[in-house]
Structures are given as C-alpha cells and as structure tokens.
C-alpha cells in the first residue's frame, strides 16, 4: 500500500496527543463502525514522530528545565539515543501508541 503522512488522533480517552504517523488510516478516531478499512501502519516511523512531537511539546512547556529545582525528579532515564532522554511518561505514551497500532492492525479488513 502506498505510504503517506497522516494526522492520527487517539480516542478522547487515550492519554496521548495528536501525533503524526506514516501510513494511511481511513478511520483515525479509534474503534467505531467502518474502522477496519485500514492500510499498513508502521511502528518504527510512528515512534520517531511521537518522540519528535512529545519532546517538542515538552520543550514548550519547560523551556528552562535546567533551572527547575525538580529537574532531577526522575533519576533513572532510558536512552533511545545518546541525545534523547525519555522520562517515564514518554515511555508510557510510546507503549500506549504501540498498543494502539497493534490494535489498529489487528482490526484491519483483509482485502482480497
């Protein structure tokens, strides 16, 4: 299936903001009537964009984190790369998004 960039919005009850992903989603609001008409979605591409957007949002909210007294609130950080430290909330969002993509792919209609 041809890959194109789309805006994917999680359901209202999901704990992540609108993020970009590669892949075509005919239905982008979670499970509802007709939402099995999906084409391939990519976890790897999505993770890349999720990280970009969430880190971007994080910088907007806390541009001067180095000045915060609680900057070291999370002492153990998991590195996706040598440059990008991920705090637990971000790891949680990534896991949730992986779950969403697996669920969406499991809900795909088989096209003959």
């Amino acid at each position: 299936a041809p890959m194109k960039e789309a805006n994917v919005h999680g359901q209202g009850n999901l704990a992540y903001p609108a993020v970009r992903t590669h892949g075509t989603l005919e239905s982008v609001n979670g499970p509802r009537a007709g939402s099995r008409g999906l084409t391939t979605t990519s976890l790897a591409d999505t993770f890349e964009h999720v990280i970009e957007e969430l880190l971007d949002e994080d910088q907007k909210v806390r541009p001067n984190e180095e000045n915060h007294k609680d900057a070291d609130l999370y002492t153990s950080r998991v590195m996706l790369s040598s440059q990008v430290p991920l705090e637990p909330p971000l790891l949680f969002l990534l896991e949730e998004y992986k779950n969403y993509l697996d669920a969406a792919n499991m809900s795909m209609r088989v096209r003959r």
Partner: antibody, heavy 115, light 107 residues
Framework: EVKVVESGGGLVQPGGSLRLSCATS????????MSWVRQPPGKALEWLGF??????????EYSSSVKGRFTISRDNSQSILYLQMNTLRAEDSATYYC??????WGQGTSVTVSS | DIQMTQSPASLSASVGETVTITCRAS??????LAWYQKKQGKSPHLLVY???TLADGVPSRFSGSASGTQYSLKIDSLQPEDFGSYYC?????????FGSGTKLEIK
C-alpha cells in the same frame, strides 16, 4: 477468495518438537498481522502470539505460556505462516488455528502430546 | 496482563428468546474487543469487532455494546444455528487474551 489452511499436526512425545504450517492465498500476505490461537479439548480458546506485518518489521509477540518454547515465523515469498513448537508438554495438546488479523481463520490442525 | 472475565459460563435458552453474554476487562481496552462464535469442530467465526461493529455477513440480531470496561453481546430472537460457544477477545496490549467462553445450549 481468501484461503487459510493449517497442517503439520500429529502425535508427538513430551519434550519433542513439531512445526505447524499455515498456507494462505487470496490476499497481500505481507500487509497483515498473522496469529496463532489454540483450543485444548473441552477448554477455552488461548491466544499464543502473532507476527507483525512488513511495515512493522515482522516482529513477534507471545503469550507467557509459550514464550521461549514456541517461535512464530513467516515465509513471505510463499505466503506461509509457521509455528515451531519445542519442548512440548501434555498441556500443549490442542487444536491449533492460524488467523489473518481476527478476520479469517483456518480449519485448525490437531496436536497431541503424549508418551 | 489484561484479564477477560466472561459470564455466564453456560446458558440455556429457547429459539426466539433474547440472550446477553458479558465480558469484563480488568483494565481499559479502549473498545478493542471482538466476539466470536465457535462450534464444535469448526474454527472461530468473527461476529463483532471494536466492541460494537458487526462483521460482514453477520445477521443483525447480533449486537455488541460497551459500558466502561464491561462489554456485552446480545442475540435477539435466537435461531437454531446460534447455539454453540461464544468468546470475547481483547486487542489492547499483548497478550490478547480470550474470555473463558459461554456455552449457549438449546432449552
């Protein structure tokens, strides 16, 4: 027409190995997640695991009951899904089903683990 | 892991009656739930997906609903071919566990 046909079941001794196959046709195999599910005699359905599609790197997930013993793989050139089962136990006796997403299921193949 | 608690385990009903089967998820599965019909010696047959969407070719007497973490399958005006076992399965975070099943028998 979408077709899903499992094969490879049979009688095997405890501790032995068996490889199940699931031959498919009628759809673009690489676009879809493929799953294995089993049902022991008189018991409920049990999800064993899946292998993701091409876009998601053909990565796998397993249930804790088979992780480390069972391996799901796929031959994308022939549109075949496999389930390699090692260190088989009596409790692995069941009918094994292969499924395309949740949509199409094969007729199942029976596995009996007994000495 | 998310557990699916299905009830009742068995159910006896007559042709023409309405029955409801429920599954409760131990966590939020965001409506990613399917219902299957399973007959002896046959493969599972998808009835409902995403909690309330009817699969292709499934009669309209079947319907799915959701309320919080509780999911229901209702069968109106039971037909002879509806008897068999029914299972729910969630698709939110692996493992994608099934409910324990409901055996629907003819009264």
């Amino acid at each position: 027409e979408v077709k899903v046909v499992e094969s490879g079941g049979g009688l095997v001794q405890p501790g032995g190995s068996l490889r199940l196959s699931c031959a498919t046709s009628g759809f673009t195999f690489t676009d879809y997640y493929m799953s294995w599910v089993r049902q022991p005699p008189g018991k409920a359905l049990e999800w064993l695991g899946f292998i993701r599609n091409k876009a998601n790197g053909y990565t796998t997930e397993y249930s804790s009951s088979v992780k480390g013993r069972f391996t799901i793989s796929r031959d994308n050139s022939q549109s075949i899904l496999y389930l390699q089962m090692n260190t088989l136990r009596a409790e692995d006796s069941a009918t094994y089903y292969c499924a395309i997403t949740m949509d199409y299921w094969g007729q199942g193949t029976s596995v009996t683990v007994s000495s | 892991d998310i557990q699916m608690t299905q009830s009742p385990a068995s159910l006896s009903a007559s042709v023409g009656e309405t029955v409801t089967i429920t599954c409760r998820a131990s966590g939020n599965i965001h409506n990613y739930l399917a219902w299957y019909q399973k007959k002896q010696g046959k493969s599972p047959h998808l009835l409902v997906y995403n909690a309330q969407t009817l699969a292709d070719g499934v009669p309209s007497r079947f319907s799915g609903s959701a309320s919080g973490t509780q999911y229901s399958l209702k069968i109106d005006s039971l037909q002879p071919e509806d008897f068999g076992s029914y299972y729910c399965q969630h698709f939110w975070s692996t493992p994608f566990t099934f409910g324990s099943g409901t055996k629907l028998e003819i009264k």
